[in-house]
Interface confidence: medium
């Protein structure tokens, strides 16, 4: 099954203390999938999409950007034929960066 798309959604964080919002969308006809957000190889958050939606938005509280390091990826799982679990590949990476202070 194809990899999901991933993107940062507004409002974008301006510092490490700001929350981060990341949308993850399954392509095609995979509503109600279970989505996983990863960072640094480990799971950050799990969300299930509503049965009529193909994606979710992960809302990470302020400070989530500090550890573990590395870009975010997401992935989704669905029940396929004969009730067998299937997993997508990882999304492309998305990096969270912060504006350089002007002072």
């Amino acid at each position: 099954i194809p990899a999901p798309s991933i993107r940062l959604v507004p409002p974008y964080p301006s510092s490490q203390e700001d929350p981060i919002h990341i949308a993850c969308m399954a392509p095609g006809n995979f509503p109600g999938a279970n989505f996983t957000l990863y960072r640094g190889g480990q799971v950050v958050q799990l969300l299930q999409a509503p049965t009529d939606q193909r994606g979710v938005t992960f809302n990470l509280s302020g400070g989530s950007s500090k550890a573990p390091g590395g870009p975010f990826h997401c992935q989704y799982g669905v029940l396929g034929e004969l009730n067998q679990s299937q997993l997508s590949d990882l999304s492309e990476p998305v990096n969270v960066s912060f504006p350089v202070p002007t002072w």
Epitope: G41, Q42, G80, L87, L90, E92, P93
Partner: antibody, heavy 117, light 115 residues
Framework: EVQLVESGGGVVQPGRSLRLSCAAS????????MHWVRQAPGKGPEWLGI????????VYADSVRGRLTISRDNSKNTLYLQMDSLRDEDTAVYYC??????????WGQGTMVTVSS | QAVLTQPASLSASPGASASLTCTLR?????????IYWYQQKPGSPPQYLLR?????????GSGVPSRFSGSKDASANAGILLISGLQSEDEADYYC?????????FGGGTQLTVL
């Protein structure tokens, strides 16, 4: 330091069952997917399946689906592999491996399973 | 035809470079896959080396020297593990792996000999 220690291997007759365990330490077990991989003597590795962090989502290789059951107990930091209807071709070293995203980075030392009458 | 094909063996001299290939079956486009590489020495489990999809989507294993690197050859539909400055301790079996059809698939492995 991440450590994975498999146990439960041995010699078993064809058609019988066996349960392997993998004790994990040195990382937050519940935050990582876990895998079982086997390697027959003189052959390359063969992936058997993945169980996600909360245990609700398990994906198996086609070659073993229906005969193998992967489970985990996050309170005990332990991964399990239940193998039923064992065949001669199941003879291999069985490794558990720690998830890295949905792949795997660290492997245990393995436990040998020999299926023989 | 196997999903991933690796040459059974390869020999190279100390200090030289070795290029290990992992060819994807026809109809499977290497450009869309992350290729993972593992090293295995006799009597030990495989060790994770690196993952490579593109220069913007790659990851080196913890403690893996930078002389191990990944790339792709789109014309050959292959992933490549490049080992530069070969050392005697690099003598091992090397396996590639991809996530394909909701399963991890390994190549048959390449036995690298450092002469």
């Amino acid at each position: 330091e991440v450590q994975l220690v498999e146990s439960g291997g041995g010699v078993v007759q064809p058609g019988r069952s066996l349960r392997l365990s993998c004790a994990a330490s040195g990382f937050t077990f519940s935050s990582f997917a876990m895998h079982w991989v086997r390697q027959a003597p003189g052959k390359g590795p063969e992936w058997l399946g993945i169980i996600l962090y909360e245990g609700g989502h398990v994906v198996y290789a086609d070659s073993v689906r229906g005969r193998l059951t992967i489970s985990r107990d996050n309170s005990k930091n332990t991964l399990y592999l239940q193998m039923d209807s064992l065949r001669d071709e199941d003879t291999a070293v069985y490794y558990c491996a720690k998830g890295f995203y949905h792949a795997f980075d660290v492997w245990g030392q393995g436990t040998m399973v020999t299926v023989s009458s | 035809q196997a999903v991933l094909t690796q040459p059974a063996s390869l020999s190279a001299s100390p200090g030289a470079s070795a290029s290990l290939t992992c060819t994807l079956r026809s109809g499977i486009n290497v450009g869309t896959y992350r290729i993972y590489w593992y090293q295995q020495k006799p009597g030990s489990p495989p060790q994770y080396l690196l993952r490579y999809k593109s220069d913007s989507d790659k990851q080196q294993g913890s403690g893996v020297p930078s002389r191990f690197s990944g790339s792709k050859d789109a014309s050959a539909n292959a992933g490549i593990l490049l080992i530069s400055g070969l050392q005697s301790e690099d003598e091992a079996d090397y396996y590639c792996m991809i996530w394909h059809s909701s399963a991890w698939v390994f190549g048959g492995g390449t036995q690298l000999t450092v002469l």
